[in-house]
């Protein structure tokens, strides 16, 4: 990894758990310079592998609401608007970091957690399994 | 929102910035129960809207490495393996949370940050703009 000189103005940490426990400012800074309001908003419907978004809510997690994509079909939509089963719709998944309240129900104490979410779907050529 | 009774065993927080600043345990808990080892690993190549993955590294961020998808073509791959420009490859984007070292170079002090990442690509029917 890259070694960075420590800033002398850093908060002091005498915590015996350091560096496992850190201070985090929850005032979110939004670095999304991309101001295109549409972004992926209508792709779910226009895609050849369309998907629906399902709300996943968990008050013990931050963010408490995550949207999960579920592909509508196993096949993909062809030029005629019909499902073509010679192609496969598959979910595009990503591991993301969330904060989990620990101990439970605590407003100011969290643990980092990695979860797998489905962001949308894409159309792929199927894997052909050859029988020996 | 859902009101949850506070756990009496929560760490005490006398910090004047509370609840903006919280304690976070960086020992990541991996909740990915989905044990399908393949996941999205080969979809980038098999997709009709294939993409390449680019490494984005920033030592001031946690996680320091994020992979960004970039669609290979403007169009989509058709059944003959050629690019069909009557369809569009578009990136599926997601807002994710990362931790940004604040003040810079501090090992134990962070601020939550929201960034927009491209996770993969999907093939969509183009929007037709009719000229008046």
């Amino acid at each position: 990894g890259i070694t960075i000189p420590r800033n002398p103005g850093c908060p002091n940490s005498e915590d015996k758990n350091f560096p496992r426990t850190v201070m985090v400012n929850l005032n979110i800074h939004n670095r999304n310079t991309n101001t295109n309001p549409k972004r992926s908003s209508d792709y779910y419907n226009r895609s050849t592998s369309p998907w629906n978004l399902h709300r996943n809510e968990d008050p013990e997690r931050y963010p408490s609401v995550i949207w999960e994509a579920k592909c509508r079909h196993l096949g993909c939509i062809n030029a005629d608007g019909n499902v073509d089963y010679h192609m496969n719709s598959v979910p595009i998944q990503q591991e993301i970091l969330v904060l989990r309240r620990e101990p439970p129900h605590c407003p100011n104490s969290f643990r980092l957690e990695k979860i797998l979410v489905s962001v949308g779907c894409t159309c792929v050529t199927p894997i052909v399994h050859h029988v020996a | 929102g859902i009101t949850i009774p506070r756990n009496p065993g929560c760490p005490n927080s006398e910090d004047k910035n509370f609840p903006r600043t919280v304690m976070v345990n960086l020992n990541i808990h991996n909740r990915n129960t989905n044990t399908n080892p393949k996941r999205s690993s080969d979809y980038y190549n098999r997709s009709t809207s294939p993409w390449n993955l680019h490494r984005n590294e920033d030592p001031e961020r946690y996680p320091s490495v994020i992979w960004e998808a970039k669609c290979r073509h403007l169009g989509c791959i058709n059944a003959d393996g050629n690019v069909d420009y009557h369809m569009n490859s578009v990136p599926i984007q997601q807002e994710i949370l990362v931790l940004r070292r604040e003040p810079p170079h501090c090992p134990n002090s962070f601020r939550l940050e929201k960034i927009l990442v491209s996770v993969g690509c999907t093939c969509v029917t183009p929007i037709v703009h009719h000229v008046a």
């Epitope: 629906n52 399902h54 999960e68 579920k70 196993l74 979910p91 792929v124 894997i127 | 989905n34």
Partner: antibody, heavy 124, light 113 residues
Framework: QVQLQESGPGLVKPSETLSLTCTVS????????VSWIRQPPGKGLEWIGI???????DYQSAFKSRVTISVDTSKNQFSLKLSSVTAADTAVYYC??????????????????WGQGTLVTVSS | DIVMTQSPLSLPVTPGEPASISCKSS????????????LAWYLQKPGQSPQLLIY???TRQSGVPDRFSGSGSGTDFTLKISRVEAEDVGVYYC?????????FGQGTKVEIK
């Protein structure tokens, strides 16, 4: 507990529109999709179509030109409209909840809860 | 449309004895991406609406007794009842949820001898 209840006129005249309502309780509308299925007297089951959690729909091609499925989330109600009916549309009509499975990334077309069904007779 | 063919159409059974129903699909129901077979079994008891017994070929729906089991892959599937009980009578349907429209078999009527 999960409940679905179909309601609507038991008799419809040929060429008119069959309209049924499915009132649901015990589950979250934003999570689940709902299908309509019918069963002609003494026959098997036939899937008509589905309305997804976001209000989008998918219909069996045989019905596409004359079927509409919609939802009124404020009333927890789904509706089925089938136009230009004939005697062949006489059946018991069911609404059913599509199964929702966490950590499974496809819409599900298995039905895990059904209404009691309502018989619609098409006759003049 | 995918044709689901069940056999037998009528099955007289003796309580305590095993029973087996076959369902054949006109196309494979195995999805290559996740190796799941998109087949379910329902039971419609007399005067009632159908109830889901098994999905993905062999996964029992919660609350379904373990005397019910499903097997098969591709185009050939079987529902087995290890020991039939009086409450198991009714019409059993298989259903595929791979291809739209999602079609059902014509049903197998199970009755006590």
């Amino acid at each position: 507990q999960v409940q679905l209840q179909e309601s609507g006129p038991g008799l419809v005249k040929p060429s008119e529109t069959l309209s049924l309502t499915c009132t649901v309780s015990g589950f979250s509308l934003p999570s689940h999709s709902v299908s309509w299925i019918r069963q002609p007297p003494g026959k098997g089951l036939e899937w008509i179509g589905i309305i997804w959690n976001n209000g989008g729909t998918d219909y069996q091609s045989a019905f596409k030109s004359r079927v509409t499925i919609s939802v009124d989330t404020s009333k927890n109600q789904f509706s089925l409209k089938l136009s230009s009916v004939t005697a062949a549309d006489t059946a018991v009509y069911y609404c059913a909840r599509n199964m929702y499975i966490t950590d499974y990334y496809y819409e599900n077309y298995f039905m895990d809860a059904w209404g009691q069904g309502t018989l619609v007779t098409v006759s003049s | 449309d995918i044709v689901m063919t069940q056999s037998p159409l009528s099955l007289p059974v003796t309580p305590g004895e095993p029973a087996s129903i076959s369902c054949k699909s006109s196309q494979s129901l195995l999805f290559s991406e996740n190796q799941k077979n998109y087949l379910a079994w329902y039971l419609q008891k007399p005067g009632q609406s159908p109830q889901l017994l098994i999905y993905w070929t062999s996964t029992r729906q919660s609350g379904v007794p373990d005397r019910f089991s499903g097997s098969g892959s591709g185009t050939d599937f079987t529902l087995k009842i290890s020991r039939v009980e009086a409450e198991d009578v009714g019409v059993y349907y298989c259903q595929q949820s791979y291809y739209t429209p999602y079609t059902f078999g014509q049903g197998t009527k199970v009755e006590i001898k």
